[in-house]
Amino acid sequence: SQVSQNCHNGSYEISVLMMGNSAFAEPLKNLEDAVNEGLEIVRGRLQNAGLNVTVNATFMYSDGLIHNSGDCRSSTCEGLDLLRKISNAQRMGCVLIGPSCTYSTFQMYLDTELSYPMISAGSFGLSCDYKETLTRLMSPARKLMYFLVNFWKTNDLPFKTYSWSTSYVYKNGTETEDCFWYLNALEASVSYFSHELGFKVVLRQDKEFQDILMDHNRKSNVIIMCGGPEFLYKLKGDRAVAEDIVIILVDLFNDQYFEDNVTAPDYMKNVLVLTLSPGNSLLNSSFSRNLSPTKRDFALAYLNGILLFGHMLKIFLENGENITTPKFAHAFRNLTFEGYDGPVTLDDWGDVDSTMVLLYTSVDTKKYKVLLTYDTHVNKTYPVDMSPTFTWKNSKLPNDITGRGPQ
């Protein structure tokens, strides 16, 4: 049903859903801090623009009695329950920030008349693609897929002269929310990734993965998995690995690889890590000081959600336009705004664009080094290290199929 919005006469409210089930196990207090820091910045920016208005956030807490798993598995109804709570209280703001779980976002989008914008720190799954009033501030699965297909096809770099068309995907069901949906997208038979590959098999058991590492009859040399180095070590340990195996470790929200004193463990030598380019000022910022690298990105997305709302509010107010309109609800896309840590770009569908970074372990220095970067906004690769000190033969990535001749 239509809910009146607290969104006019110089007073603009943001509804922040504080759900018990979340993409990342982050104390809600930290998210509140991030939102409040964002509000301070927005107020300052609006004041500097000569706009004398009030911007506040209302935090809507779930009762947590029914939906208490803490992860996203029971989030489907929690989001709707919170919306019902908002509806009953007649306390809808100009914009809804949260939820972060794909299940809840999808259901909320499906079951409500969204005449207001929804901003999500998460909602990684393909089912949340192309939603007209949904904005996602953490890289969704679609962006990962486009990178992987682009990289698989590449055969014109001195370190990658073979196009790939095959892959194993390791997915055992214990993944974090982001990894779950990233791997889900790769597994889906109708996805772009599956469409572009000639062979793809999902490995669901630890033993399956371990066996492939030395199996002479394997159908692909490439294995995609998602998680951190420790996750890989638990699975792989110090087992021998065939020399032409390449493991692609998707670990987007982890900037530990860029820290000065980090040395890559030996088990990472056959691994390319896909992560996001780290922010400049985040490490010392007040809201992120006590957060782990992953949670920093999650809290940052909440903060940037507030800044995005401030950006749009400023534009509409300066143009004398109404905020409680479909035009406003559909405006949170195809733009760049000033985020907490520099410019943030949203694509035509309201999904954040970013610079993905592919790292390798230098056999000389045992450090993580940047191999290439990939701009998701223009789907373009930027080579960085043209002569990487790889573990693989001739400092080139191997063919994806053992024994196949030169291409």
């Epitope: 014109d156 770099l157 001195p158 043209m386 400092s395």
Partner: antibody, heavy 118, light 106 residues
Framework: EVQLVQSGAEVKKPGASVKVSCKAS????????MNWVKQAPGQRLEWMGV????????NYNQKFKDKATITRDTSASTAYMELSSLRSEDTAVYYC???????????WGQGTTVTVSS | DIQLTQSPSFLSASPGDRVTITCSAS?????MYWYQQKPGSSPKSWIY???NLASGVPSRFSGSGSGTEYTLTISSLQPEDFATYYC?????????FGGGTKVEIK
Amino acid sequence: EVQLVQSGAEVKKPGASVKVSCKASGYTFTDHNMNWVKQAPGQRLEWMGVMNPKFGTINYNQKFKDKATITRDTSASTAYMELSSLRSEDTAVYYCARDNYPNYFDYWGQGTTVTVSS
Amino acid sequence: DIQLTQSPSFLSASPGDRVTITCSASSSVNYMYWYQQKPGSSPKSWIYRTQNLASGVPSRFSGSGSGTEYTLTISSLQPEDFATYYCQQYHDYPPTFGGGTKVEIK
């Protein structure tokens, strides 16, 4: 418009060093690798090395590893190449060239002539 | 390092002629790149990834080939095409250039 403007011609004595600059404009300097290429009189083009201005990664052609040192100043959008222990065979035109993968070396500087003569 | 051998080294032709320049690699490469250089000027990117014309290059130019043999073809030579053409590979590190083919007016 993309432009790479190199420093002027240099005449040096054997044993000396020279530092050639290449100022980039018309694009984001840190987005693209910068290559250096040598063209000695009557010789083919020779690739010397490449630098990624964003991460500072540098790859040298083994042949020039002890001859050339590539650096950059990102705030000035400028790449540099220093040649040490100059000898007569270092007499050449030196070019900087932007890498715009997949179109390698898509823009070139105008070249800097280095003459080594006693 | 991969050696690139261009032939011919010199080529005399008249405007309107069809001209073909060959580049042979000492081992197989996936793609070839071509540059044009005029006297007193720096090289210009001309053809990349074997057959893609760089920005501003006339459509009378074309590139083809695979493996170790690549060609640059000018379908109808124009006065402004008289220059030296270099092939280049980046399949293996380091990138290497051919010795050049000088196209002169007959």
